[in-house]
Interface confidence: low
């Protein structure tokens, strides 16, 4: 079969499984005159042979782990042994089989973890190697925890990243590990090849001993601080401590107060810096933060609670300069005249704000003193001795002492004696007829004027009229405002009218006085009136159940995932069709019938979250009226952005020749979300060939130092490739390039002959 197993001499590549016994020829090369024989050279390892007439074969099983590619050359020779064709490259790629088991680098690992460490943050790595090809399942390793000892309530406190061997705490481990209860744990870890997916995989195990150390980075108990302290400030009120020395402490005022009266020193001691005022602010919540020497947070902030304890530093205050009450001439003894309600800014329901009331003076004392009494704790004034006569004394003035446990305040009360309320309000009409209104009549519209009269003393509580709707408006759509001078009632719309729920309303009004009627007089039919409200239909737009609909999904949800739904109803009962407006990124679609919203494209938190679109509900049929609501999609972060350089680093240079090894600092960032702690990048050189010249060392989670290993550099630009790994789940890696120029310098600046440059470096090292 010419072409597959035989053919002319030309460059070729063959793939052969390792471990496979030689059972067939690889290829039959055909000689073109004057060529008569063939010769094989290169990495034959005495395995590959070519017969004189061009038959290429191998004589024993290959081993990929010894050599994964055999680079051979085949030449055609003439009768005199002179090469007349070739040599041409023949490449034998040895395909992997699973003939090597994974092996842990150590039979026992030891590590420690601090209680309450962040779940998912690695504190120890186990590492296994497998000589098989990592690009195939044969060399793909899968780590697992076989057993955790002790196991409490069947809860796993530890987890392992199946791919990287990184051991970290589970959520339960972060919350429950306690060295006082159990200071050490043992894990048995297994590693399997074939990605752990095959019964035929090889495996190995190792033991991991873990010590749990105490986390002293804990929120202190809430602090109580007495207000208006006269002690010298600052006063230490509590403390926090990081687990290791050298932390830098600071306080964060989340409330952004104009005056923040707390500080922290570098021991972690927290102070109040000035006297507090409970009446200004009765409690403070702020955060203590511990950072490393580079300003990176070492852990989550701790919440500090300070409660300000009350002292009695406020006197009672009167509700107004003079409080006016009315009392009818013939009121009975014990009747309530009104209640004086004084205030005290000190803490409620404590002795500091508990008030006592006492009448200290009555003027005039006619016909006698002590006509009134006040309830000591409630402040309610009552008639004490007899009924009053308006013609004798139309007005009394009382001075009332209001006291808390330390302060006294005088309040003034004026009591007007008024005519007895023996006349009831009488409506000028008992029936105000029918009124027809459209359901979309504006709120606040006056729709009817009603009028009752009362023959009692004018401008007193006996003649003042209050109108109430006592029937026909259970929804409270209507209200009545009264003109105090004329007692005219204005019926107004307080809430939208609704044809669908109340097409006809039979309204009943009652007219009452604020003062009680005298004994024996009762309200009768004259104090009631009615009217009929007829509401006509207006085709209304659909109504959404919410002004804003909100949903939360991970930014990596599969296309077609339901991410939320909206609902609207049409007041007339028509069907509704839903649509989207403002989907500028083309991420979403909505089911026209159900209102369910689905993703139709990959979502991206870094493009902006929440993603806001409008949802439109339109009547099907009718007038096709529509309403609009908001749909806000909150996108939760996944680690989908590789690290990159935080800024442009073109223009870095060293003056050539180097007198000593030099270094420069660079910063990395990525667009994913980093709560509290910020990123934790690791840095390495991007290719092995750079290691002779350069070295990269981590400074902190975002900064690293690039150093030269020697001084023998050419006068030119070097592009140094750096790998930055974000350690996320999954970990992402970016390869960035730092261009560094070695150039002759004039006065510390780079000098290049014209013609070799388009720009001048700006940063010298």
């Amino acid at each position: 079969q010419e072409g597959k197993f035989s053919g002319p001499l030309k460059p070729m590549t063959f793939s052969i499984y390792e471990g496979q016994e030689p059972s067939q020829i690889i290829f039959q090369f055909k000689a073109n005159p004057p060529a008569v024989t063939f010769e094989l050279t290169g990495e034959t390892d005495n395995i590959f042979v070519i017969e004189r007439e061009g038959l290429l074969y191998y004589n024993r099983a290959l081993d990929r782990e010894t050599r994964s590619t055999h680079n051979l050359q085949v030449a055609a020779l003439d009768a005199n042994g002179i090469i007349v064709e070739g040599p041409v490259p023949i490449t034998i790629k040895v395909k992997d089989i699973n003939d090597n088991r994974p092996t842990f680098l150590q039979s026992k690992y030891e590590g420690s973890v601090r209680q309450n460490s962040r779940p998912g943050k690695p504190f120890l790595y186990v590492n296994a190697t497998d000589l098989d090809d990592p690009a195939t399942p044969n060399g793909q390793l899968y780590y697992q925890i076989v057993i955790q000892l002790p196991m409490i309530n069947n809860v796993m406190y530890f987890q392992i990243n199946n791919k990287t061997g990184a051991i970290s705490l589970t959520r339960e481990g972060s919350q429950e590990l306690n060295p006082a209860k159990n200071p050490s744990y043992n894990l048995v870890i297994s590693v399997k090849d074939m990605g752990g997916q095959s019964e035929n995989s090889f495996s190995d195990t190792t033991s991991v001993d873990i010590i749990v150390t105490e986390n002293i980075w804990k929120a202190p108990k809430p602090v109580e601080m007495v207000e208006n302290s006269t002690d010298p400030h600052p006063i230490k009120i509590t403390q926090v401590r990081w687990n290791d020395p050298g932390a830098q402490y600071s306080l964060v005022d989340k409330e952004k107060l104009p005056r923040f009266p707390f500080s922290i020193d570098q021991e972690g001691d927290i102070y109040v810096t000035q006297p507090l005022d409970r009446e200004e602010k009765d409690a403070y919540v702020f955060y203590a933060v511990a950072k490393d020497e580079y300003g990176k947070p070492l852990s989550y902030p701790l919440e500090i609670h300070v409660k300000v304890k009350d002292i009695n530093d406020n006197p009672p205050t009167c509700p107004s300069p003079v409080t006016v009450f009315e009392v009818q001439e013939n009121e009975r003894l014990g009747n309530s005249i009104g209640t004086l309600t004084a205030h005290d800014r000190d803490e409620e329901n404590t002795a500091n704000s508990f008030l006592n009331y006492r009448i200290v003076e009555q003027t005039p004392k006619l016909p006698m003193d002590g006509l009134f009494l006040i309830q000591t704790y409630a402040g309610m004034l009552q008639l004490a001795k007899q009924s009053l006569k308006k013609q004798d004394t139309p007005q009394y003035n009382l001075t009332i002492e209001v006291s808390d446990k330390d302060f006294k305040t005088l309040c003034f009360v004026q009591i007007n004696v008024i005519d007895i309320n023996d006349q009831i309000p009488i409506f000028e009409k008992s029936d105000y007829g029918n009124l027809t209104l459209a359901e979309d009549t504006n709120i606040g519209s006056t729709i009817l004027t009603i009028q009752a009269t009362d023959a009692d003393e004018p401008f007193t509580g006996s003649s003042k009229i209050l109108y109430h709707i006592i029937k026909g408006d259970s929804e409270g759509r209507l209200g009545v405002d009264t003109d105090p001078h004329t007692n005219t009632g204005y019926v107004i719309i307080k809430k939208p009218l609704d044809f669908e729920t109340a097409a006809v309303s039979n309204i009943v009004f009652k007219a009452e006085n604020p003062e009680p009627l005298v004994f024996g007089v009762k309200y009768n039919a004259s104090s009631f009136a009615k009217f009929t409200l007829i509401v006509t239909d207006v085709n209304e737009a659909p109504q959404f159940s919410q002004h804003v609909f909100q949903a939360k999904v991970s930014e990596d949800v599969a296309i077609g995932t339901k991410v939320g739904n909206v609902t609207a109803k049409d007041p007339e009962g028509l069907d509704i069709s839903y649509s989207l407006r403002g989907d500028t990124r083309g991420w979403l679609k909505i089911d026209h019938v159900t209102g369910e919203i689905f993703s139709v494209a990959p979502l991206d938190r870094e493009a902006g979250s929440p993603y806001r679109v409008q949802v439109v509900a339109t009547e099907v049929g009718g007038s096709s009226l529509s309403s609009v609501s908001e749909f806000h999609l909150i996108l939760m972060d996944v680690n989908d952005n590789p690290p990159r350089l935080a800024k442009d680093y073109t223009g870095l240079f060293f003056c050539h020749p180097l007198s000593a090894p030099g270094s420069l600092i660079f910063e990395a960032t990525d667009d994913d979300q980093h709560l509290f702690r910020g990123p934790h990048f690791t840095f390495s050189l991007g290719s092995g060939s750079l290691q002779n010249d350069w070295e990269v060392s981590k400074i902190n989670g975002t900064h690293a130092r690039l150093s030269t290993r020697h001084t023998e550099f050419e006068e030119r630009e070097y592009v140094v490739l750096i790998r930055i790994n974000d350690g996320g789940r999954p970990p992402l890696e970016g390869i960035v390039s730092l261009p560094v120029t070695f150039c002759s310098c004039v006065e510390g600046s780079c000098f290049r002959p014209a013609g070799h440059q388009t720009g001048i470096p700006t940063v010298g090292m």
């Epitope: 073109t650 223009g651 991007g686 290719s687 060939s689 750079l690 030119r716 630009e717 070097y718 592009v719 490739l721 390869i735 390039s737 261009p739 120029t741 150039c743 780079c750 290049r752 070799h756 440059q757 388009t758 720009g759 470096p761």
Partner: nanobody
């Protein structure tokens, strides 16, 4: 002395293709990032494609998906395959050693895209 000699430029119709070559001498080629820049009349020179020493590549947005940079360390040569050419690709194309504005530049080869 460093020398970068470009070839392969010329006149081509919109939608057509060209392959530029740049032969380098005077440098340890395999240790250099190489690139192609271009300068249109009245505009600044811009680097449109780079290839680093581990063969990773980088492209300006304006040429992404149309231009491909490659290198042959054995021949000390870097190539730029230009497909789907547009009139706005008309420029003098320069070879660059060092992968940035401060590297060494060749004398350039003219590419004109016109119907």
């Amino acid at each position: 002395e460093v020398q970068l000699v470009e070839s392969g430029g010329g006149l081509v119709q919109p939608g057509g293709s060209l392959r530029l070559s740049c032969a380098a001498s005077g440098i340890r080629f395999s240790r250099y990032a190489m690139g192609w820049g271009r300068q249109a009349p009245g505009k600044q020179r811009e680097l449109v494609a780079s290839i680093f020493i581990d063969d990773t590549t980088n492209y300006a947005d304006s040429v992404k998906g149309r231009f491909t940079i490659s290198r042959d360390n054995a021949k000390n040569t870097v190539y730029l395959q230009m497909n789907s050419l547009r009139p706005e690709d008309t420029a003098v194309y320069y070879c660059n050693a060092g992968g940035g504005a401060l590297g060494y530049w060749g004398q350039g080869t003219q590419v004109t895209v016109s119907s």
